[in-house]
């Protein structure tokens, strides 16, 4: 029960985290104009990974996309890549983890397969979370570096904008969303990995019980294959312990054939 809860919670936490990573990636407020030096500005600038925006005195916000790919700074491209990789890995992880959930039965999927899938999704969530945290941190570092640059027409490296001294940019809401979301995805991934460890031993126990039961139920009678009651009872055992190591179970039930030798 605890394993199912851990797995379910890990899935939900990761789901929230990935939704947050997607939200952060799409948000325009990765960097916002620092109002410390100019608190009376009627024109408020903020920038995202895909476009830069200006909120004017009328309350109207105008956004312009970065319609160049080669003209953008390598750091911005790297952040974009990290966030996209994080989203893709997270999405695949979610897909895998849905099938791995213990509370969801899909055909005759064995617990060992579910354990492997849980571990796979957990690792994917961990990597996804790390990608998001790395992406946001790289961008934050870029902001901190640019904040202290005081060259009159410095190239800020955010959307290829030329920035004059008076406009400095500080951390936007998207950075905090990204950090939190990355952290949640990471935590969710760790929970999935923990749940996997809980799933694996249960399977081993089942196999052990299965072997034990098989051993006791086989009746070694010289009456040949038909006379063997053990084969029939072992079939029942296999239905009860739908556990995975079938070949071994079958090997256990066949010694009666050797009576012919």
């Amino acid at each position: 029960m605890a394993v199912t809860a851990c797995q379910g919670l890990g899935f939900v936490v990761s789901l929230i985290g990935i939704a947050g990573i997607i939200a952060a990636t799409c948000m325009d407020q990765w960097s916002t104009q620092d109002l410390y030096n100019n608190p009376v500005t009627a024109v408020f600038n903020y920038q995202g990974l895909w476009r830069s925006c200006v909120r004017e005195s009328s309350g109207f916000t105008e956004c312009r996309g970065y319609f160049t790919l080669l003209g953008l700074p390598a750091m911005l491209q790297a952040v974009r890549a990290l966030m996209i990789v994080g989203i893709v890995l997270g999405a695949i992880g979610l897909l895998v983890s849905i099938f791995a959930l213990k509370c969801i039965r899909i055909g005759s999927m064995e617990d060992s397969a579910k354990a492997n899938m849980t571990l796979t999704s957990g690792i994917m969530f961990i990597v996804s979370g790390l990608c998001a945290i790395a992406g946001v941190s790289v961008f934050a570092n870029m902001l901190v570096t640019n904040f202290w640059m005081s060259t009159a027409n410095m190239y800020t490296g955010m959307g290829g904008m030329v920035q004059t001294v008076q406009t400095r940019y500080t951390f936007g809401a998207a950075l905090f969303v990204g950090w939190v979301a990355g952290g949640l995805t990471l935590i969710g991934g760790v929970m999935m990995c923990i749940a996997c460890r809980g799933l694996a031993p249960e399977e081993t126990n089942y196999k052990a019980v299965s072997y034990h039961a098989s051993g006791h139920s086989v009746a070694y009678k010289p009456g040949g294959f038909k006379a063997s009651t053990g084969f029939g009872s072992n079939t029942k055992n296999k239905k009860i312990y739908d556990g995975g190591a079938r070949t071994e179970d079958e090997v256990q039930s066949y010694p009666s054939k050797h009576d012919y030798v």
Epitope: V40, V54, S58
Partner: antibody, heavy 115, light 113 residues
Framework: EIQVQQSGPELMKPGASVKISCRSS????????IHWVKQSRGKSLEWIGY????????RYNQKFEGKATLTVDKSSTTAYMHLSSLTSEDSAVYYC????????WGQGTLVTVSA | DIVMTQSPSSLTVTAGEKVTMTCKSS????????????LTWYQQKPGQPPELLIS???TRQSGVPDRFTGSGSGTDFTLTISSVQTEDLAVYYC?????????FGAGTKLELK
């Protein structure tokens, strides 16, 4: 069609207060701030402040802080400006303006303060 | 506060003449975020509210005749009327749309000779 309609002229006694209305239609009312501008006879324009109809947030020109109070009623898409403790200096035409770069202005409300 | 200085205060012209009026701001109106100058020009005829002519220093408002041209950057701006018509007789105001409080120039009055 975008329209910005202001209330009629007001003749007030010194020390009294007045509330001017500005009704907007034909556009998304909560998407643009409503700005208020004062124009004394034969003089230039003075920005009083704005109100954000979406949040109700306001910003005032320091010169008009305490004199003007801006409010909004989203349901009737109407902005209001309340002028208190009127003096002869407050006699002027008051305009409300909205949309990008003050593209639309009300016709103006003449406030006359006289004993 | 940003001070807007307009010159001349009045202009006497004849129809068809080219007219240039200037507006100087005490601080730069250039926004580095989008490289736009937040200066607006309005035309006000007697008994009427101001009417938007040009935004962001050079963007003509739709419906405004192309004889009106705005130019300039930073602190120095110009409004040019290539061929004055009688309906252009009005007061022209420039406005700082970059910093609070938003401020207007004293205006340039265009009169007929």
């Amino acid at each position: 069609e975008i329209q910005v309609q202001q209330s009629g002229p007001e003749l007030m006694k010194p020390g009294a207060s007045v509330k001017i209305s500005c009704r907007s239609s034909g556009y998304s009312f909560t998407s643009y701030y409503i700005h208020w501008v004062k124009q004394s006879r034969g003089k230039s324009l003075e920005w009083i402040g704005y109100i954000d109809p979406f949040s109700g947030g306001t910003r005032y020109n320091q010169k008009f802080e305490g004199k003007a109070t801006l409010t909004v009623d989203k349901s009737s898409t109407t902005a209001y400006m309340h002028l208190s403790s009127l003096t002869s200096e407050d006699s002027a035409v008051y305009y409300c303006a909205s949309l990008r770069f003050f593209a639309y202005w009300g016709q103006g409300t003449l406030v006359t303060v006289s004993a | 506060d940003i001070v807007m200085t307009q010159s001349p205060s009045s202009l006497t012209v004849t129809a068809g003449e080219k007219v240039t009026m200037t507006c100087k701001s005490s601080q730069s109106l250039l926004n580095s975020g989008n490289q736009e100058n937040y200066l607006t020009w309005y035309q006000q005829k007697p008994g009427q509210p101001p009417e938007l002519l040009i935004s962001r220093a050079s963007t003509r408002q739709s419906g405004v005749p192309d004889r009106f041209t705005g130019s300039g950057s930073g602190t120095d701006f110009t409004l040019t009327i290539s061929s004055v018509q009688t309906e252009d007789l009005a007061v022209y105001y420039c406005q700082n749309d970059y910093s609070y409080p938003l401020t207007f120039g004293a205006g340039t009055k265009l009169e007929l000779k």
